[in-house]
């Protein structure tokens, strides 16, 4: 007789999810070898604990804290890329800019990108069938509760000058309830970083508006300076024709500057 | 079958340089995820980890030892060459080849038979 | 450096024995901790590693269980060819060390 089993409203775990993630940490150690050190069954231990005979709405910070320390790592100061609502060109930044990181460029986030994961009260097994929705659901599930923990360390170690990518065309460039704006901006150490620097990138080829004088960017200056971090904006006006510079800065349509408008 | 022999002079005189060589088959360091490491036993002691190094020339040291220490590969004769230079009577050990491999981190699941180094004038 | 603290440093037991040996991390080592068995004479082999999971060959006797910095290696059932000493190995970060071992006789 099958067991009854919870039905949630968001989708399951992505299928083959231990073994996705351990073929994850292995390529990660292969490709940085500052993270050799890391033994990618203990990972997987700690992260299958976080959740693993859980209800799945009522995951907390602490229970990702095992996988927290097996992740550890720092990243230079200047070189954090905060991003919301625009990943791709984010990491696509990252993959040329290859001195500058995103969360998903680190162990922990690049483990975790674009898979989902839940377990169920008092069994050892992994539900594929469904996991909550952050909406429909809850809020302290798995994923939703990882990405806040690991959000929150990564902003709290930035130093430097702090960048974020935020996206031109949305109605809300900058987003309070993202994670960005809901975890990122208020773990940011003033005491450690001098400045956030935003990158509002435009949608349009025609769009030639000011977009950091949006109410929104207004709003996290305000923030931001309440924090005793000084706060910058750039527009970057055509995506591709910056990842086009960032990859070949010596081109000479790049020397007239491809984003204009730097606020204080 | 991966095997891993350990080879180099059985007595060595305090301040010399000590030249071991690992020479492994079944195991190649040109393949990703590879890597071949050394461990050394005193005489009725505990194991004491001294160097590794991976299939992309990544090395790592014993801090305790550094500065002694080196290690490097020949990929294409199978080998792995440790050098510890000014060596002591109190280095007087049997000295271990053993493979690691990544995803175990720093697990050494094969090893060699070792060899007993004698540092004695 | 995280020091490996093994008990006891010798113990005797008679054939069918349940044998249970610990190790204790000076810090938190998640669960990176591996156990090796040495036979007079010979290499150290490698029996459990990640705290719990028995390497390929292993026979299912041998077990290992723990997390942080308490950790404990279990033969269910002693076999003469079980003789030996067995140390413990952190294995989650440089420089690696070990316990000191632990020295297994037969009564």
């Known amino acids: 007789v099958p067991r009854w089993r919870q039905q949630w409203s968001g989708s399951g775990t992505t299928s083959r999810f231990p073994e996705t993630v351990l073929a994850r940490c292995v390529k990660y150690t292969e490709v940085h070898p500052e993270m050799r050190h890391v033994d990618c069954q203990s990972v997987w231990d700690a992260f299958k604990g976080a959740f693993i005979s859980k209800y799945p709405c009522n995951i907390t910070e602490e229970d990702y804290q095992p996988l927290v320390k097996l992740g550890t790592q720092t990243v230079p100061c200047n070189k954090t890329l905060l991003w919301s609502r625009i990943k791709d060109l984010a990491h696509q930044f990252t993959q040329v800019q290859r001195d500058m990181f995103t969360l998903e460029d680190m162990l922990l986030g690049y483990l975790a990108d674009d898979l989902t994961w839940c377990g169920e009260f008092n069994t050892f097994e992994i539900n594929y069938q469904s996991c909550p929705d952050w909406r429909k659901d809850c809020s302290n599930n798995p994923v939703s509760v990882f990405w806040k923990t690991v959000s929150r360390r990564f902003a709290e170690t930035a130093c430097g000058v702090v960048h974020v990518m935020l996206n031109g065309s949305r109605s809300k460039i900058f987003d309070k309830n993202s994670t960005f704006g809901s975890v990122e901006v208020h773990n940011l150490q003033p005491e450690k970083v001098q400045a956030l620097e935003a990158w509002v990138i435009h949608g349009g080829r025609e769009d030639s508006r000011d977009l950091c004088q949006d109410p929104t960017i207004k709003e996290l200056e305000s923030i931001i300076s309440k924090r005793n971090i000084r706060f910058f904006c750039k527009n970057i006006y055509r995506p591709d024709k910056f990842l086009q510079c960032v990859k070949n800065p010596e081109d000479s349509s790049c020397l007239s500057g491809i984003h204009h408008h730097h606020h204080h | 079958q991966v095997t891993l022999k350990e080879s180099g002079p059985t007595l060595v005189k305090p301040t010399q340089t000590l030249t071991l060589t690992c020479t492994f088959s079944?195991?190649?360091?040109?393949?990703?995820?590879?890597?071949v490491g050394w461990i050394r036993q005193p005489p009725g002691k505990a194991l004491e980890w001294l160097a590794h190094?991976?299939?992309?020339?990544?090395?790592r040291y014993n801090p305790a030892l550094k500065s002694r220490l080196t290690i490097t590969k020949d990929t294409s004769k199978n080998q792995v060459v440790l050098t510890m230079t000014n060596m002591d009577p109190v280095d007087t050990a049997t000295y271990y080849c053993a493979r690691i491999e990544l995803g175990r981190s720093y697990v050494m699941d094969y090893w060699g038979q070792g060899t007993l180094v004698t540092v004695s004038s | 450096d995280i020091q490996m603290t093994q008990s006891p440093s010798s113990l005797s037991a008679s054939v069918g024995d349940r044998v249970t040996i610990t190790c204790q991390a000076s810090q938190d080592v998640i669960t990176s901790v591996a156990w090796y068995q040495q036979k007079p004479g010979k290499a150290p082999k490698l029996l459990i590693y990640?705290?719990?999971y028995r390497y390929t060959g292993v026979p299912s006797r041998f077990s290992g269980s723990g997390s942080g910095t308490d950790f404990t290696f279990t033969i269910s059932s002693l076999q003469p060819e079980d003789i030996a000493t067995y140390y413990c190995q952190q294995h989650y970060t440089i420089p690696l060390t070990f316990g000191q071992g632990t020295k297994l006789e037969i009564k």
């Open positions: 990640s705290a719990s």
């Open positions: 190094i991976w299939w992309d020339d990544d090395k």
């Open positions: 079944g195991l190649s360091l040109s393949t990703s995820g590879k890597g």
